[in-house]
């Protein structure tokens, strides 16, 4: 796979993953509760990082934010923070990678600068993906360990039904957002790794840039302004007729330097 293709694919995969991380963070179905068949209407409860929702069998849905809750655990706050950090790093990674893409020309940016930017964006995507995966995994662990609530009956006043309080739903299950988050985090991570691999291909190899000089014995060889390519017929590709003149370079000529083949 060419460097450009690897870099471009890595960027696209990371972009898809990043979009998934945003979607997961905003989704309400991080945890769902077993359908509760109330005699009046079937009720389906589900909860996200920011609000809790209830959907009735009629289709009516009501969501309420957690700002009225008295006790938000530190672990939920940590999951929120991890997802937000993942999004922020993803945004920075996307901005950096856009400038780092080999197929995009910005000023006189050389390959070494693009390589560094590609590596930076790759690392940002990797960290972003890891943040999302850890965040979702921590939430899933909270569900598994903490959310199996035993039915509690608390009686007050007279016996029988009077003043009774009991839990309605006792079981929490994984919501769709968890799976979206895991997949999205994985994609972002894979995209970041691909960007890092592409960086290696972009890094200039020192052996390509050493000046070459040939000494012909017994005769003076005149300097050719056109360089080796012009004098020998090499590089007569009609697509790339511009010889280095200090201006813009085409993609195929981007490793040409004024000192590369100036002496024959």
């Amino acid at each position: 796979m060419s460097v450009t293709a690897c870099q471009g694919l890595g960027f696209v995969v990371s972009l898809i993953g990043f979009a998934g991380i945003i979607a997961a963070t905003c989704m309400d179905q991080w945890s769902t509760q077993d359908l509760y068949n109330n005699p009046v209407t079937a009720v389906f409860n589900y909860q996200g990082l920011w609000r809790s929702c209830v959907r009735e069998s009629s289709g009516f849905t009501e969501c309420r934010g957690y700002f009225t809750l008295l006790g938000l655990p530190a672990m939920l706050q940590a999951v929120r923070a991890l997802m937000i950090v993942g999004i922020v790093l993803g945004v920075i990674g996307i901005l950096v990678s856009i400038f780092a893409l080999k197929c995009i020309r910005i000023g006189s940016m050389d390959d070494s600068a693009k390589a560094k930017m590609t590596l930076t964006s790759g690392i940002l995507f990797i960290i972003s993906g890891i943040c999302a995966i850890i965040g979702v995994s921590v939430f899933a662990n909270m569900l598994v360990t903490n959310f199996w609530m035993s039915t509690a009956n608390m009686y007050s006043g007279m016996g029988g039904m009077g003043g009774m309080v009991q839990t309605v739903q006792t079981r929490y299950t994984f919501g769709a957002a968890l799976f979206v988050g895991w997949v999205a985090g994985g994609l972002t991570l894979i995209g970041g790794v691909m960007m890092c691999i592409a960086c290696r291909g972009l890094t200039p190899d020192d052996s390509n840039f050493k000046a070459v000089s040939y000494h012909a014995s017994g005769q003076n060889v005149a300097y050719r302004p056109g360089g080796f390519k012009a004098s020998t017929g090499f590089g007569s590709n009609t697509r790339n007729k511009k010889i280095y003149d200090g201006g813009a370079r085409t993609e195929d000529d981007e490793q040409s330097h004024p000192t590369k083949y100036d002496y024959v």
Partner: nanobody
């Protein structure tokens, strides 16, 4: 601590009317369904009428056409307007609320019952 308190019960003549009120209080995050159940002496508890947040209502066959349930979501209160009362409507009427408490996360959904209010229909 969350609780529901009923009021409005009492003695009424056949054909008369009564309006029962039930207010939920405490650390309430949201209420899904509020309803009225009744239990006559020696009989099992039965649903009289219920109403969901979305406005879905359900009535027992014996209550249809005579009883009307309504709800004030802002006040966490449910009302049961009972008309054309019959002696067989005599029972202890219990308020029931399926609600979420605001004391913890994840949101815990509880089924809360009131102490009950006695409705007696007698000449």
């Amino acid at each position: 601590e969350v609780q529901v308190v009923e009021s409005g019960g009492g003695l009424v003549q056949p054909g008369g009317s009564l309006r029962l009120s039930c207010a939920a209080s405490g650390s309430i995050f949201s209420i899904n369904v509020m309803g009225w159940y009744r239990q006559a002496p020696g009989k099992q508890r039965e649903l009289v009428a219920g109403i969901s947040t979305g406005g879905t209502t359900r009535y027992a066959d014996s209550a249809k056409g005579r009883f009307t349930i309504s709800r004030d979501n802002a006040k966490n209160t449910v009302y049961l307007q009972m008309n054309s009362l019959k002696p067989e409507d005599t029972a202890v009427y219990y308020c029931n609320a399926d609600l979420a408490t605001a004391t913890s996360w994840p949101v815990r959904y509880l089924e809360v019952w009131g102490q009950g209010t006695l409705v007696t229909v007698s000449a």
